[in-house]
Interface confidence: medium
């Protein structure tokens, strides 16, 4: 999906009002220095591409993020403020339903959400410092 047509200010508002808090809740009890940020983005569409990938694509050791509150709110924000996004996500939704039904917070998931926090911070204020 091409994120260049999204309403970035509206997505930023959604992040500041709710998504950021849900990410903090998920990470509660984890030290902010525990994980190194290895994923970066250079502008807002690039950030959203990385955010979508980390949030909705199951990875080894962490298959359950899509059902988390921050993920559902992220999906809603993208669906509302990125024209045509919902239509591109039909296959992804089917894959999500096949994913594990139980929520399991693994260390790998915590690391992934830590990366997401960094990406969202960059989206909120694009740092443009790394390619």
């Amino acid at each position: 999906y091409d994120f260049t047509n999204c309403d970035f200010e509206k997505i930023k508002a959604a992040y500041l009002s709710t998504i950021s808090k849900d990410l903090i809740t998920y990470m509660s009890g984890t030290k902010s220095t525990e994980f190194n940020n290895t994923v970066s983005c250079s502008n807002r569409p690039h950030c959203l591409t990385e955010i979508q990938s980390l949030t909705f694509n199951p990875t080894a050791g962490c298959a359950s993020l899509a059902k988390e509150m921050f993920a559902m709110k992220t999906k809603a924000a993208l669906a509302i403020w990125c024209p045509g996004y919902s239509e591109t996500q039909i296959n992804a939704t089917q894959a999500m339903k096949k994913a594990r039904k139980s929520k399991v917070t693994t260390n790998k998931c915590l690391e992934q959400v830590s990366q997401l926090q960094g990406l969202w911070r960059r989206f909120n204020r694009p740092l443009l410092k790394q390619q």
Epitope: D2, T4, S42, N43, R44, P45, H46, R125, P126, L127, L128, K129, Q130, Q131
Partner: antibody, heavy 117, light 107 residues
Amino acid sequence: EVQLVQSGAEVKKPGASVKVSCKASGYTFTTYWMHWVKQAPGQGLEWMGMIDPSDSETTLIQKFKDKVTMTVDKSTSTAYMELSSLRSEDTAVYYCARTLDGYYDYWGQGTTVTVSS
Amino acid sequence: DIQMTQSPSSLSASVGDRVTITCRASENIYSYLAWYQQKPGKAPKLLVYFAKTLAEGVPSRFSGSVSGTDFTLTISSLQPEDFATYYCQHHYGTPWTFGGGTKVEIK
């Protein structure tokens, strides 16, 4: 209305330094990055580096690291770019330009720096 | 660093002509490319960003497109005020680089 107003033309001798200013108005100064672009006479555009006005963090390309110092004064919404140890090849028009996503929606009018003995 | 190869370096055209300028990136920069117009003695002016989004106030005769690492700026019907130099610039990440420029002259 967003405006970036740069200081006037400068003529300097080799070895001297020059400080170019770029005063921003019409937007929140600390929200956007300030980049500097060089254009030598009859040449194309060359990206020099950038500064984050919110924390003064700078990124310069290698060839300008020993030549350029970028600073900001948040109280006056002004960005500065200082060129040291001037040589003839530093003769150029220097532009400031603001950005959020890497493209430049507003530019200063340019400052001509001439290095001549 | 990402290299931007712009062509042609110059072209001659008449008012009303359709003009196409291309820019090729040395690696994938997705849609992160901008186009600028510069007139002598003036600062560059943003025309297109994210490869195909027209900047505010830019006439609709300008358009941008992308195919892989090849980017195109098209002026559908050249106007007298369009004679200028055009630059592409990737905005994928540091360091930003510009194409060498295309000078559009009157035939």
